[in-house]
Interface confidence: low
Amino acid sequence: DGCKDIFMKNEILSASQPFAFNCTFPPITSGEVSVTWYKNSSKIPVSKIIQSRIHQDETWILFLPMEWGDSGVYQCVIKGRDSCHRIHVNLTVFEKHWCDTSIGGLPNLSDEYKQILHLGKDDSLTCHLHFPKSCVLGPIKWYKDCNEIKGERFTVLETRLLVSNVSAEDRGNYACQAILTHSGKQYEVLNGITVSITERAGYGGSVPKIIYPKNHSIEVQLGTTLIVDCNVTDTKDNTNLRCWRVNNTLVDDYYDESKRIREGVETHVSFREHNLYTVNITFLEVKMEDYGLPFMCHAGVSTAYIILQLPAPDFR
């Protein structure tokens, strides 16, 4: 029949709820074309009568609702003035009771049903609802482990669930629910989403940035105690070491015997895209030999130093 065959990925769908698939293939459907849907190589097109449970709505095939027996290969034929393409879509329908079993056991789920949140960041989940204009969708409700999600950290925004300050406990099975209205009838749409947590950040800069010190001198009296912080920003997934050195030697090693100058315990705070690390150096008692010597903070390939200097004499 001269039509070129294009095979799309399998779609795995839930029974007893609406489903729609749009026959779009941008290189083809951008011009003047006609679209016709068929099931299982049938010569008879899918009905265009809107009262039919399965019908074609413009370029869409719409199931109101989908039933277990609807599994199969559907074809949409796109005919242009000088071309013909047949797109094959394999639909697999399963009985799904969201609160009984985990969606994780299902094969080849699309990315719409597997989403990732980034630890320590503000992030979001998306409820994918693809339906023709004839379908009106009501407000979306979100559930985790079958309980409606409430709380300050969660905000529903159109088709998304915003999650602030993502924690490890946010992984698990989610579902988004909406009421779809079509030709005066209402149907429930319930999409399950398996959510995993990752620590990887999206920040582009891989070189750590030393915020402080900035290669400068510090005036300090002889014999006093001094603590200086080294503040470093770096990507969340970095493997850089941060430390203080003097004469190219770790301060803890250089002053191993006297322990007069020591490196502190590193702490960090998580920001939206990166961590801020702080590691201090403590001078228990500043001695003459410390003046003029660069004490270096190292963070990966980045370095910055402080130099201790005696305060200028006060002649007042």
């Epitope: 602030s164 999206g202 920040y203 940035k209 503040n231 705070v269 939206r272 895209e273 990166h274 801020l276």
Partner: antibody, heavy 120, light 106 residues
């Protein structure tokens, strides 16, 4: 040097939509966070929201039903839309961003500000 | 929502005087940010991460604090310091600003 250049109308009628553009040079909006802040008469600052490097948006809950922040990465611009404005939305609107030098939360680079009056 | 209360709302200082302005948070804040605003200009980042001076900020300025109590100090006020200073928190959304402290020079 990062520069933010704002454009948009200075007068908007009540119930209409306020639309502002922030054009960014010296940095890509596909890195970092791109914020909108406004300053009401009498110097009261309000943080409105941001669009992130990935396109994720955060909106101040007090504005959530009326605000939209979008972007066009090909133009390196981001946008503010505030629908159904009232005279209470009269303010100077600023776009602003941080920068890796200042941790992205610190609002280091600011646009020149757009003074918007809502009046019929 | 974290409420940031700045005091005093307006303060007057003579040249060379040491001044301190306060910012109190209704609940714990991880870091405080300070901005300087002068009439007809855009705000400028002044202090970030509680105590770090932004580029170009004179060394006479300092920031300190933790938990719910933060402050900005000028060791010796100069005429160019006349401005309104705002504190801001990014710890908890919605992100909020204080009401500002207006510093006037006598």
């Amino acid at each position: 040097e990062v520069q933010l250049q704002q454009s948009g109308p200075s007068l908007v009628k009540p119930s209409q939509t306020l639309s502002l553009t922030c054009s960014v040079t010296g940095a890509s909006i596909t890195s970092g966070y791109w914020n909108w802040i406004r300053n009401f008469p009498g110097n009261k600052l309000e943080y409105m929201g941001y669009i992130s490097y990935s396109g994720y948006t955060y909106y101040n809950p007090s504005l959530k039903s009326r605000i939209s922040i979008t972007r066009d990465t090909s133009k390196n611009q981001y946008y503010l839309q505030l629908i159904s404005v009232t005279t209470e939305d009269t303010a100077t609107y600023y776009c602003a961003t941080g920068g890796y030098d200042y941790v992205e939360d610190a609002l280091y680079y600011w646009g020149q500000g757009t003074s918007v009056t809502v009046s019929s | 929502e974290i409420l940031l209360t700045q005091s005093p709302a307006i303060m007057s200082a003579t040249l060379g005087e040491k001044v301190t302005m306060s910012c109190r948070a209704s609940s714990n804040v991880r870091y405080m940010y300070w901005y300087q605003l002068k009439s007809g200009a855009s705000p400028k980042l002044w202090i970030y991460l509680t105590s770090n001076l932004a580029s170009g900020v004179p060394a006479r300025f300092s920031g300190s604090g933790s938990g719910t109590s933060y402050s900005l100090t000028i060791s010796s006020v100069e005429a160019e310091d006349a401005a309104t200073y705002f504190c801001q928190q990014f710890t908890t959304s919605p992100y909020t600003f204080g009401g500002g402290t207006k510093l006037e020079i006598k």
